[in-house]
Structures are given as C-alpha cells and as structure tokens.
C-alpha cells in the first residue's frame, strides 16, 4: 500500500492540504498535524509518528495551531508604558492590554507597546470621536454650530448652548463656540461687571 | 545514466580539516535530495548528512554535529562535505547518495565512495 | 534512535538455495524499509523499497515482507552473484539507522 493520506503523508510539491492544521516537515518530506492553540510540540513528527502535543504549562500560551517547540511566556500589561489589562492570559490568548484612558498609542508592533497622553483640546473644540478609544492623539475639531467648549482638555465633549426661554429667561448675551448663552431674569437689567455670566 | 564520483578523501591528522566533493551527473540533480553516508569495519553503515534540494535544508546526526557541514552547488551538479576537527572515528569510507525523490524515500543511486582516515 | 536487529550476520548457503534474512526493528517503522546488497569494495545497491516493493533492474528472485517491526528479505534460489553482504535501513524516522548487515558466503 502507498503511504497514509492523513498525517503524516508524502508531499512531493512541498505544500500540504490543510495549511492552517498542518505544516511541511523538510527532514522526513512529509506533511505532519500541527499542535492546536493552548498547545505546542512534545515529539517532532516523522514518517512513521504524527506530531506529539502537549498543554502549554501556567502562565505560557499558544495562540495558532503551530509547530512550535515552546509557548510563549506570558506578559504583563506594563503600566509605565501606560498599558493596562482587559483580558487575563489563558493558554490560547496572550494577555489583552489596552491604553489607560486619557492616553493613545504611540508606539505599534503589532500590539500597542507604548501609550502616551492624549493632547488637549482647546476651548471651543473637542476630540475627533475615534471608531477605537486610544488608537491615535486627539484630533481637535471645532464645535458645531450651537455649542461650545470652555476648557483645555483631553476628553470634554461640546455643549449645546443654554436655552434661555426654557428656563424662563431671555438671553443676555449669545453663547459662543468657547462660552454658554448668558441668560438674564426678564426683568433686571444686566450690569455691565456680570457680563457673560447667567443672572438668577 | 546516473553517476555520483565521490572525491577528496585522503590522510588527515586528528584536529585537522577535509572537504569531500561529489560530482554528479545524468539527473537533474537540483531536484533531489542528497546525502553522505559512511561505512566503517566497526560501525557498519551510518548517516553523516542531508541536504534538500534547494540547499536550503541541511540535517545531522549528533556525531558529526557542529563539525561537518554539507553543501551543495545546483549549477554545478556539485554535493560536498566540509569535515572540521576531525577525530579517528570518523575513518570511513564516505558515499554520496541520491534520495528518490517520489513517496518511499529509499536511496537509488550510491556514488563508489571516497576513503577518510584520521590518524597522527 | 531506532535499533535495527538484522539477523543472521553471517549466513553459509548453495547456489539454487533459498535463503531468507530478518531484520526487527525497535519500534513500527510502518514499511519505511529498504534492503541494500553490497559487494566487496562496491557500493551498497538498493534491492527492495518499503518493505516489499522491487527496485528497477532487481531480479524477481528477490522479495522483501512484513510489516510493523519485523521484516524479510528472501532470494528464492541463489545464484553464485547473489553472494554478498545484506544490509537493512530504516528512513522512517531519522537519524536513519542500518542493520548490522548479513554476509552471505558459498557453503
């Protein structure tokens, strides 16, 4: 009978049928299993031996179906770099880290290695809204129209300007995109020193 | 026809260095793995190393690991063995052999061999 | 490493006999087994390929069995050019490992 036709099996183009399960072994010329995530190679496979896994050990994981002799040693979240844990290490995962927040990555090796402090945005403008929180530095947009922003910060979101009339008083002075609508009682006269704050 | 001419053998003192070369022709040798196998009266028939047929493969026994090494040149039809701290163990004769390069793995071709010995 | 036990190591026989050499090997090596005849200061010649399959050139008298561990070379009837020394090897797991060889002489 011709060789086996599950692993390990002949494979005369270097090339084996299940790329992710398997991997070419060029000693022996032979396709041969690859050990599952949470696992790494004990024995080496042969012609006549499969593959030999066994469990990563505590703190060490796999994350692939791989041939590696070894599992990764598992890494804290370094929180000098300003990294912090979402997800603890398991066998199969490394351990999840994302920047602290206020903070954005600034350094990339296909994870965040280092996270800095966002920039602040400045009265009248307010942080770019981002599809993921700390992937990059603030980009300052201003407000829009009928809202404003009095502070140097990070993370302060726009306001809409203060509706005089709903609270039963008229507008005193209008709001700006860096200050609130001053509101005035109807009947008093606004002095000049209380300009741009809101009269009760 | 295929050939394999194994040459470069000879007398060397322990410690010392060879290189064995092998010529070979009537394949296409680019498409074969080779190896070096040796025979002496006590051992009998051994392994000494593998090479795939890009080179890009080379493969040993712990006897001879870390001071043999095999090469090949494709565009030369050329296999060889740098042989480096040579000790008398390593007295042998030395055969270049191809590996069919199909599904059994057995060795088809043996050159007539090439005789190393290590003495002072 | 897998140990090949190739018996006889030597072997006295007569043209026309039928002659059979064994080699056990130290775990299943799964057919990964070739036979090899060899001639005074000549190179080992391949005869039989995973365990029972003919080599090109190679008479018919010749014929490898078995399976697992255990393995057998056969020469039906001996011709006075079959006397020589018969080595197995095993290429299913390296380091690729021979039998001690069986020299096979005129009775």
């Known amino acids: 009978s011709q060789p086996q036709a599950v692993p390990p099996y002949a494979s005369e183009n270097q090339t084996c049928r299940d790329q992710e399960k398997e991997y070419y072994e060029p000693q022996h010329r032979i396709c041969c299993s690859r050990c599952p995530p949470g696992t790494y190679v004990s024995a080496k496979c042969s012609r006549i031996r499969d593959t030999v896994c066994a469990t990563c050990a505590e703190n060490s994981y796999n994350e692939h179906w791989n041939y590696l002799t070894i599992c990764q040693l598992c890494r804290p979240c370094d929180p000098v770099m300003g990294l912090e844990e979402i997800a603890p290490c398991t066998s199969k995962r490394k351990t999840q880290c994302r920047c602290q927040p206020g903070m954005f990555c600034a350094a990339w090796a296909l994870e965040c290695t280092h996270c800095e402090l966002l920039s602040d945005c400045p009265p009248g403008t307010e942080a770019e809204l981002k599809d993921e929180v700390g992937k990059g530095n603030n980009h300052c947009v201003p407000c829009k129209a009928g809202h404003f922003q009095n502070t140097s910060s990070p993370s302060a979101r726009c306001q809409p300007h203060t509706r005089c009339e709903n609270q039963g008083l008229v507008e005193a002075a209008p709001g700006t995109a860096q200050s609130d609508t001053t509101c005035k009682n109807p009947l008093e006269p606004l002095p000049p020193e209380m300009s741009g704050t809101m009269l009760m | 026809e295929v050939q394999l001419v194994e040459s470069g053998g000879g007398l060397v003192k322990p410690g010392g260095s060879l290189r064995l070369s092998c010529a070979a022709s009537?394949?296409?040798?680019?498409?074969?793995?080779m190896y070096w196998f040796r025979q002496t009266p006590g051992k009998g028939l051994e392994w000494v190393a593998t090479?795939?047929?890009?080179?890009?493969?080379?493969y040993y026994p712990d006897s001879v690991k870390g001071r043999f090494t095999i090469s090949r040149d494709n565009a030369k039809n050329s296999l060889y063995l740098q042989m480096s701290s040579l000790r008398a163990e390593d007295t042998a004769m030395y055969y270049c052999?191809?590996?069919?390069?199909?599904?059994?793995?057995?060795?088809?071709?043996w050159g007539q061999g090439t005789t190393v010995t290590v003495s002072s | 490493d897998i140990k090949m036990t190739q018996s006889p190591s030597s072997l006295s026989a007569s043209v026309g006999d039928r002659v059979t050499i064994t080699c056990k090997a130290g775990?299943?090596?799964?057919?990964?087994l070739s036979w090899y005849q060899q001639k005074p200061w000549k190179a080992p010649k391949i005869l039989i390929y995973?365990?029972?399959r003919l080599a090109d050139g190679v008479p018919s008298r010749f014929s490898g069995s078995g399976s697992g561990q255990d393995y057998t070379l056969t020469i039906s009837s001996l011709q006075p050019e079959d006397f020589a020394t018969y080595y197995c090897?095993?290429?299913?797991?390296?380091?690729?490992?021979f039998g001690g060889g069986t020299k096979l002489e005129i009775k």
């Open positions: 052999v191809r590996e069919e390069n199909g599904n059994f793995y057995y060795f088809d071709y």
């Open positions: 090897l095993q290429h299913g797991e390296s380091p690729w490992t």
């Open positions: 009537g394949f296409t040798f680019s498409d074969y793995y």
């Open positions: 090479i795939s047929d890009g080179g890009s493969y080379t």
């Open positions: 775990q299943d090596i799964k057919s990964y």
């Open positions: 995973y365990a029972t």
